[in-house]
């Protein structure tokens, strides 16, 4: 059967910046900001687009050592990311796969809402363990908050980059963030 679980969580980080860090660069960020949750992410095949296969390894002590994810959709315009967990742990035994959809929506206060859908495709009459749903949610929260903390501590990271001309700067050409751009023009 298919069991669908939907959750929403909020972040103080703007949608575009969060999508760039949490979704597009999670492979690099997760082991760095949450080593207790994820030890490494390895690209098995593909370039990040649909069809890409990633191996996510977990630290020593966790009962299951890795999962493999397949990227199904990356929508840069609407900040949407669909992927499926296709291997590891109970996948292949009680579960066929877990299909996940993440959509990051901007909020008026400058933050964002993450709308998350997890579809558990079970084999035969197997049901989804409540503990599985809880663990998935906790892992997602752990990663999100770790990335959020990193972004709050590194205000210049994962911001939109604008190329400012030499005339504007009165000197050499360089990349600066949108915040810097605003600051520059107000002067």
């Amino acid at each position: 059967g298919v069991f669908n679980y939907e959750t929403e969580t909020t972040s103080v980080i703007p949608a575009a910046r969060l999508f760039k860090a949490f979704i597009l660069d999670g492979d690099n960020l997760f082991p760095k900001v949450a080593p207790q949750a994820i030890s490494s992410v390895e690209n098995i095949e593909g370039n990040g687009g649909p069809g890409t296969i990633k191996k996510i390894s977990f630290p020593e002590g966790l009962p299951f050592k890795y999962v493999k994810d397949r990227v199904d959709e990356v929508d840069h315009t609407n900040f949407k990311y669909n992927y499926a967990v296709i291997e590891g742990g109970p996948i292949g035994d009680t579960l066929e796969k877990i299909s996940n959809e993440i959509k990051i929506v901007a909020t008026p206060d400058g933050g964002s809402i993450l709308k998350i859908s997890n579809k558990y495709h079970t084999k035969g009459d197997h049901e989804v363990k409540a503990e599985q749903v809880k663990a998935s949610k906790e892992m997602g929260e752990t990663l999100l908050r770790a990335v959020e903390s990193y972004l709050l501590a590194h205000s210049d990271a994962y911001n939109e980059q604008k190329l400012i001309s030499e005339e504007d700067l009165g000197g050499e050409q360089k990349l600066i963030s949108e915040e810097d751009l605003h600051h520059h023009h107000h002067h």
């Epitope: 009962p63 050592k65 996948i91 503990e131 599985q132 663990a135 906790e138």
Partner: antibody, heavy 123, light 108 residues
Framework: EVQLVESGGGLVQPGVSLRLSCVAS????????ITWIRQIPGKGLEWVSR????????YFADSVKGRFIISRDNSKNTVYMQMNSLRAEDSAVYYC????????????????WGQGTLVTVSS | DIQMTQSPSSLSASVGDRVTITCRAS??????LNWYQQKPGKAPKLLIY???SLQSGVPSRFSGSGSGTDFTLTISSLQPEDFATYYC??????????FGQGTRLEIK
Amino acid sequence: EVQLVESGGGLVQPGVSLRLSCVASGFTFSNYDITWIRQIPGKGLEWVSRISGSGGSTYFADSVKGRFIISRDNSKNTVYMQMNSLRAEDSAVYYCARRDSVLFSMNSWLDPWGQGTLVTVSS
Amino acid sequence: DIQMTQSPSSLSASVGDRVTITCRASQSISSYLNWYQQKPGKAPKLLIYAASSLQSGVPSRFSGSGSGTDFTLTISSLQPEDFATYYCQQSYSTPPITFGQGTRLEIK
């Protein structure tokens, strides 16, 4: 059906060796750690050893460290426990069990267990 | 190592009774606590995992609760097949996993 079957137990003299086997079926064997638990008849349960799904990590109770060796052959869905320098206090029923869990969790439990194999060390 | 202490060590009860077995950990183990049932000559069988989750196929008269250091296993209405020995086990600090000493449930 998920199943574990132990074999290899028997009556041996102190100081000798014995190899127990645990054959698994009904699940993706290499995804799961396998644990050995022992029980002196009429007494409680004592954890003995654990091996990771790949076989790369092994763990032992202090009481058997340096004497017992755990290994696995994932092509045969089998875990082995080589018990050397056996002592009278190693006499027990030995169970193998799958370390079960859910994805992304640190929590784990033992399910299922094999039927057990009796090891008696006596002169 | 984390010590697990069960109480009582044994108890007598009648069919239809409500029975509670407690398990205390020597330090906080969050919800990393499992319960097993063992009948004479048989292997232990998982009843409850993660303190309160009922294992598939286990009758709903069994329930688990607790968090931190204190946990309980409750059988709401004892059936003849429930007379057995029950063990708690922590998986918070592993290795080693540790078990309680067991609670033997006998017919009154």
